[in-house]
Amino acid sequence: TRDVREPPALKYGIVLDAGSSHTSMFIYKWPADKENDTGIVGQHSSCDVPGGGISSYADNPSGASQSLVGCLEQALQDVPKERHAGTPLYLGATAGMRLLNLTNPEASTSVLMAVTHTLTQYPFDFRGARILSGQEEGVFGWVTANYLLENFIKYGWVGRWFRPRKGTLGAMDLGGASTQITFETTSPAEDRASEVQLHLYGQHYRVYTHSFLCYGRDQVLQRLLASALQTHGFHPCWPRGFSTQVLLGDVYQSPCTMAQRPQNFNSSARVSLSGSSDPHLCRDLVSGLFSFSSCPFSRCSFNGVFQPPVAGNFVAFSAFFYTVDFLRTSMGLPVATLQQLEAAAVNVCNQTWAQLQARVPGQRARLADYCAGAMFVQQLLSRGYGFDERAFGGVIFQKKAADTAVGWALGYMLNLTNLIPADPPGLRKGTDFS
């Protein structure tokens, strides 16, 4: 017989990502004896909560908490029983709840209270349900991407930790109700609200971040729908042959479409709207989402928001990935350059509903929105953020890194559980358990 060293015990953490359109649960794990190492935390499992985001339960807060039960029950199975009590559980809500908090703070509080009540019933170490600021959402997404890609520090073969010279990656997140851009910058921000100073593993990072509320995919689609109703009476971004009944109350209930809301409208009225497969009119409609008329700083992205020039490589995730992946995979179109991305958007916008359905079978009506989505992504990156062909060459569209979803959830947990120390790690001896 010989002594066999047991693998180290694992620790777990749970984050509920309460997005505007749906909630996802992520369970993370890491070896208990390597808590301060980098790149050591990975995704153990995930679960998609059925139904809409928690903000859609404004009139039924208990429904929000009830919707989480299936995934929480899965968490009881996925995390070993003896680890339940020591497993931190967080819920972070993003732009959907930020919007609800703007229009109906009481409903927003009620939803969070109902959710909190349910989460405390479980044997995990519940550490709160709260609404993240746009800045937090952006920064935690940036932390996640760079942590997973080991851009902060690495463990060298000589037994020392060192900072890789490749620098950090910028992060771009396109959610349902907001979009975030975050990247490391050398010069101080002209707008202090857009700058975050981070100390990670003994290194100092100056990070630019901005979150654009109402510029998430779903809200953009609603705004385009409102514009189409207002100016055309048809939808240039929808495919010809596609038509649907639009409930005006659904279109104008969001604060994002408030500016387009007619003075007197019947919220229960339905309007029939048809697509026209018109890429040029669609481009014009999307252009109307961005304002470049005034900039109180030396330079801006759009809507008078300060932004330094984009620098370095970027990872674009969530709906950025899904949109570009649809063009690349489902439509078989090249998207390696900005020019190709624009051509791909035009290609999709030229398709009739019959052509689109035949190319991409078995899809829900959401298929009709890929033209607008592609046109928006192309314009946001090129005109909005100012990516030129050279800079766009450094953008990778990714859903996962190291088998872990890229998004704010991991960065949030790493921060709240102090899994990324501010101080540099000391010299460590590794133990091989293989």
Epitope: P50, T329, A354, Q357, A358, P361, G362
Partner: antibody, heavy 120, light 108 residues
Framework: QVQLVQSGAEVKKPGSSVKVSCKAS????????VSWVRQAPGQGLEWMGR????????QYAQKFQGRVTITADESTSTAYMELSSLRSEDTAVYYC?????????????WDQGTLVTVSS | SYELTQPLSVSVALGQTARITCSGD??????VYWYQQKPGQAPVLVIY???NRPSGIPERFSGSNSGNTATLTISRAQAGDEADYYC???????????FGGGTKLTVL
């Protein structure tokens, strides 16, 4: 009433190719697509690829990429599936299935299939 | 890559209700299709778009889909319902149709 009629059973040697045809009788390929699905003995269904003849659009499952070619002749309303570099694991019943716009391009009409046996 | 998981077999007493599940990540966001295949025959579409029946399919067949699970329900099961049942969905990420492994339904 559209029916699909496939070519007859084939016995092939490893390394060779097979080309199976599928003719739509009583209708055309206008607005339809055709998928090829295979089923090894005692196994489940496996999608190989599809063609939208009126768009000239083809898609293949990654597993068969480079080994399968799907074509269609609109004038005769016939679709073809050619599988090359055959190996014993390719022994299966090969079905062609019509994808209909009325069913969101899922498979609403199937033929009885063509048995392809790969044996040395 | 996207996978659909079905139980290998399901048994139901004659006249009772059979439920066959099909699980996959966020399958509720996709449309699910169900096919019935009897020995030596080609598959037949019994449910499309989650819960719709093609003409000629009895009302006893119904479907549902939400979250991570789609379900085919066969009420008042008959001996003639004995067959293999496959769920299918289109995987947008890889531009391909995906079939579940199939479930053998036995009517006792």
């Amino acid at each position: 009433q559209v029916q699909l009629v496939q070519s007859g059973a084939e016995v092939k040697k490893p390394g060779s190719s097979v080309k199976v045809s599928c003719k739509a009788s009583g209708g055309t390929f206008d607005s339809y697509a055709v998928s090829w699905v295979r089923q090894a003995p005692g196994q489940g269904l496996e999608w190989m690829g599809r063609i939208v003849p009126w768009l000239g659009h083809t898609q293949y499952a990654q597993k068969f990429q480079g080994r399968v070619t799907i074509t269609a002749d609109e004038s005769t309303s016939t679709a073809y599936m050619e599988l090359s570099s055959l190996r014993s694991e390719d022994t299966a019943v090969y079905y062609c299935a019509r994808e209909s716009p009325g069913y969101r391009y899922s498979f609403d009409v199937w033929d009885q299939g063509t048995l392809v046996t790969v044996s040395s | 890559s996207y996978e659909l998981t079905q139980p290998l077999s399901v048994s139901v007493a004659l006249g009772q209700t059979a439920r066959i599940t099909c699980s996959g990540d966020a399958i509720g966001e996709k449309y699910v299709y169900w096919y019935q295949q009897k020995p030596g025959q080609a598959p037949v579409l019994v449910i499309y778009d989650d819960n719709n029946r093609p003409s000629g399919i009895p009302e006893r067949f119904s479907g549902s889909n939400s979250g991570n699970t789609a379900t085919l329900t066969i009420s008042r099961a008959q001996a003639g319902d004995e067959a293999d049942y496959y769920c299918a969905s289109y995987d947008l990420q890889q531009a391909r149709w995906v079939f579940g492994g199939g479930t053998k339904l036995t009517v006792l």
